[in-house]
């Protein structure tokens, strides 16, 4: 469910939402750390209905959800965390 990507691209998110999305409707969460052309951390949520939304990393619910997923999966996430480094 959680994917972390390190890319050299500029920011992907034009607009961010803080509106809660229930876990069951989320297909994938992509985390883009700050740096490499983008000054902020970005979180992209891919939903079960094929739509995509950028979520404000400060939104309480996304922080809580990622923490819950990390805890509940106890070292193995339901989908592995992919770390891809592009020089």
């Amino acid at each position: 469910v959680l994917e972390v990507y390190y890319t050299s691209l500029r920011c992907r998110c034009v607009q961010e939402s803080s509106v809660f999305i229930p876990r069951r409707f989320i297909d994938r969460i992509q985390i883009l750390p700050r740096g490499n052309g983008c000054p902020r951390k970005e979180i992209i949520v891919w939903k079960k209905n094929k739509s995509i939304v950028c979520v404000d990393p400060q939104a309480e619910w996304i922080q809580r959800m990622m923490e819950v997923l990390r805890k509940r999966s106890s070292s193995t996430l339901p989908v592995p965390v992919f770390k891809r480094k592009i020089p």
């Epitope: 509106v19 229930p22 069951r24």
Partner: antibody, heavy 120, light 106 residues
Framework: EVQLAESGGGLVQPGRSLKLSCSAS????????MAWFRQAPPKGLEWVAS????????FYRDSVKGRFTISRDNAKSSLYLQMDSLRSEDTATYYC?????????????WGQGVMVTVSS | DIQMTQSPSFLSASVGDRVTINCKAS??????LNWYQQKLGEAPKRLIY???NLQAGIPSRFSGSGSGTDYTLTINSLQPEDFATYFC????????FGGGTKLELK
């Protein structure tokens, strides 16, 4: 007191359409995701569709995709399920339910159910 | 899609008994598992949410446990009003119910 009241059920021929309504009271309707579930004796309980707070996002079980449309009118505190191209396997009692609010709190409110029978 | 296999389908017990009902998911559901009770002609009523949290107003004789793919509902000291049908529901990825367990008086 929270109340969810479904209406619009009945007997309909295969291939025809029906629109279910759910009238909500006793809570701030627009603060909640809403859903339709159904129950048919041989198949047990099934989730049918869900809709986000403002109606901008909707989700469907595979077997109803392209045939059913979930919608809501927050001004009327009402939830709808437009059912087109009905099949005999859609025969069931349909329930309107609340899902999460903005904080992620997930209460347990169900309507009394409305019967839909698809038969020629 | 996630499948939920609930067992047993039928269960006979007496007042005062301790019973357990099991649900097995086809993949890890991260403890996003609820238990419901349903009586004839009524809507389902949630007993337990997210594996082990007791719904407000539900007696403490009901409890839930599990993780990963395997989950259990336990009813300690059955009361006459507990004879009903019980369902599990995963809400980790969309929703899937178990097939139900009909708990009958022996």
């Amino acid at each position: 007191e929270v109340q969810l009241a479904e209406s619009g059920g009945g007997l309909v021929q295969p291939g025809r359409s029906l629109k279910l309504s759910c009238s909500a009271s006793g809570f701030t309707f627009s603060d909640y995701y809403m859903a339709w579930f159904r129950q048919a004796p041989p198949k047990g309980l099934e989730w049918v569709a869900s809709i986000s707070y403002d109606g901008g996002d909707s989700f469907y079980r595979d077997s109803v995709k392209g045939r059913f449309t979930i919608s809501r009118d927050n001004a009327k505190s009402s939830l709808y399920l437009q059912m087109d191209s009905l099949r005999s396997e859609d025969t069931a009692t349909y329930y309107c339910t609340t899902e999460e609010d903005y904080s992620g709190s997930f209460p347990d409110y169900w309507g009394q159910g409305v019967m839909v029978t698809v038969s020629s | 899609d996630i499948q939920m296999t609930q067992s047993p389908s039928f269960l006979s017990a007496s007042v005062g008994d301790r019973v357990t009902i099991n649900c097995k998911a086809s993949q890890n559901i991260n403890k996003y598992l609820n238990w419901y009770q349903q009586k004839l002609g009524e809507a389902p009523k949630r007993l337990i949410y997210d594996t082990n949290n007791l719904q407000a107003g539900i007696p403490s004789r009901f409890s839930g446990s599990g993780s990963g793919t395997d989950y259990t509902l336990t009813i300690n000291s059955l009361q006459p009003e507990d004879f009903a049908t019980y369902f599990c529901l995963q809400h980790n990825s969309l929703y899937t119910f178990g097939g139900g367990t009909k708990l009958e008086l022996k």
